[in-house]
Interface confidence: medium
């Protein structure tokens, strides 16, 4: 609305930087013949670039990534008792952040 | 996978606490009727509930929000030519989170 | 504070029957997954039996397998474990102990104990 | 019925390093927990998921598991560490404890 302006501060860009994300992992990223199962714990803490840039034209991407394997408990049910197992996922962290310009594809004349 | 497990850490679960997480303002929020101008900041940062609880049956919830209103710039393009007006745009931040019970509606029989 | 407290021990003669209760305080009960170990004088822990965090899941050592029966109540913030048909290899100081998480994990946190003794 | 086999007893000097061993059946595929107990108290746990310590536990004890062996490492051993030690997994469909290693610091 365009009401009420007294009382707002000046909006502040969310600049393009790595922020602290929720990462859940889904099961298939342990095993995907088996679905009788569950995963603990089921979500973990990634970094990863968000935010905007100051042109229309480019976009907030991952200049440097590192991959993090963590070790999960993969809780099998087996005759209805659970059999703990480790399992290893491979997290994706953003180190660096950068904008970048898109190309967008001209269509083929 | 279950290979490779040495060199892996125990993952550490993401705890429900609020986080920075980014706002994509939308131009709607800001007038429905027409499309015909931009809107900056395109982004900014809310704080927001995210994480997994310890148990099955209770989901990470919002228990104190507070909104904010904050100033944007409303570009309206006007015969090609840019117009700048303010607009408020009010953001929801989440000031506390906890673990809440996830009521499961029984079927009617 | 949050503890355990165990309770209902004592001698009792072969064959008999004994109902221990562990009281729960300081922590939300229903949340996490609890089980029985055991002690026999001067030997290792053993552990006993398994209840998850709603009661849905029981599993037990094969030693008391059948004579035993786990339970809980989460109104009352109390652990149980209903014994029959003791054996005197059943005499052992028996701890309840809570597991951090609603599927099990590691025991966290013990009660002090409580002595059974089978004996005639 | 799966076993985690412990030797009967350690001993070590004050400030020398301690290790006792837990072996198992492809046990660096489960998750391993170290507990101490001092005479006539409950257990405590001192090492959880292999290598995790719970807070109020000293720095010195650390725990790694890999292949069939789990280790509990106590660095700087101190005279209050004398206890038995035992470590435990939950495997097929059963917490299993280790037969106990008893701790002894040498005077």
């Known amino acids: 609305s365009l009401g009420s302006l007294a009382a707002a501060e000046p909006a502040v860009i969310a600049e393009c930087k790595t922020r602290t994300e929720v990462f859940q992992i889904s099961r298939n990223l342990i095993d995907r013949t088996n679905a009788n199962f569950l995963v603990w714990p089921p979500c973990v803490e990634v970094q990863r670039c968000s935010g905007c840039c100051n042109n229309r034209n480019v976009q907030c991407r991952a200049s440097q990534v590192q991959m993090r394997p963590v070790q999960v408990r993969k809780i099998e049910i087996v005759r209805k008792k659970p059999v703990f197992k480790k399992a290893t996922v491979t997290l994706e962290d953003h180190l660096a952040c950068k904008c970048e310009t898109v190309v967008t594809p001209r269509p083929v004349t | 996978s279950l290979g490779s497990l040495a060199a892996a850490e125990p993952a550490v679960i993401a705890e429900c606490k609020t986080r920075t997480e980014v706002f994509q303002i939308s131009r709607n929020l800001i007038d429905r009727t027409n499309a015909n101008f931009l809107v900056w900041p395109p982004c900014v940062e809310v704080q927001r509930c995210s994480g997994c609880c310890n148990n099955r049956n209770v989901q990470c919830r919002a228990s104190q929000v507070q909104m904010r209103p904050v100033q944007v710039r409303k570009i309206e393009i006007v015969r090609k030519k840019p117009v700048f007006k303010k607009a408020t745009v009010t953001l929801e931040d989440h000031l506390a989170c906890k673990c809440e019970t996830v009521v499961t509606p029984r079927p009617v029989t | 504070e949050v503890q355990l407290v165990e309770s209902g021990g004592g001698l009792v003669q072969p064959g008999g029957s004994l109902r221990l209760s562990c009281a729960a305080s300081?922590?939300?009960?229903?949340?996490?997954?609890m089980s029985w170990v055991r002690q026999a004088p001067g030997k290792g822990l053993e552990w006993v039996s398994y209840?998850?965090?709603?009661?849905?899941?029981?599993y037990y050592a094969d030693s008391v397998k059948g004579r035993f029966t786990i339970s809980r109540d989460n109104s009352k913030n109390t652990l149980y474990l209903q014994m029959n048909s003791l054996r005197a290899e059943d005499t052992a100081v028996y701890y309840c102990a809570r597991h951090p998480y609603w599927y099990g994990g590691q025991l966290d946190l013990w009660g002090q104990g409580t002595l059974v003794t089978v004996s005639s | 019925s799966y076993e985690l086999t412990q030797p009967p007893s350690v001993s070590v000097a004050p400030g020398q390093t301690a290790r006792i061993s837990c072996s198992g059946d492809s046990l660096g595929s489960y998750f391993v927990h170290w507990y101490q107990q001092k005479p006539g108290q409950a257990p405590v746990l001192v090492i959880y998921d292999d290598s995790n310590r719970p807070s109020g536990i000293p720095e010195r004890f650390s725990g790694s598991n890999s292949g069939n062996t789990a280790t509990l490492t106590i660095s700087g051993t101190q005279a209050e560490d004398e206890a038995d030690y035992y470590c435990s997994a939950f495997t097929h469909n059963s917490d299993v404890f280790g037969g106990g290693t008893k701790l002894t610091v040498l005077q």
């Open positions: 300081g922590f939300t009960f229903s949340s996490y997954a």
């Open positions: 209840i998850s965090d709603d009661g849905s899941l029981k």
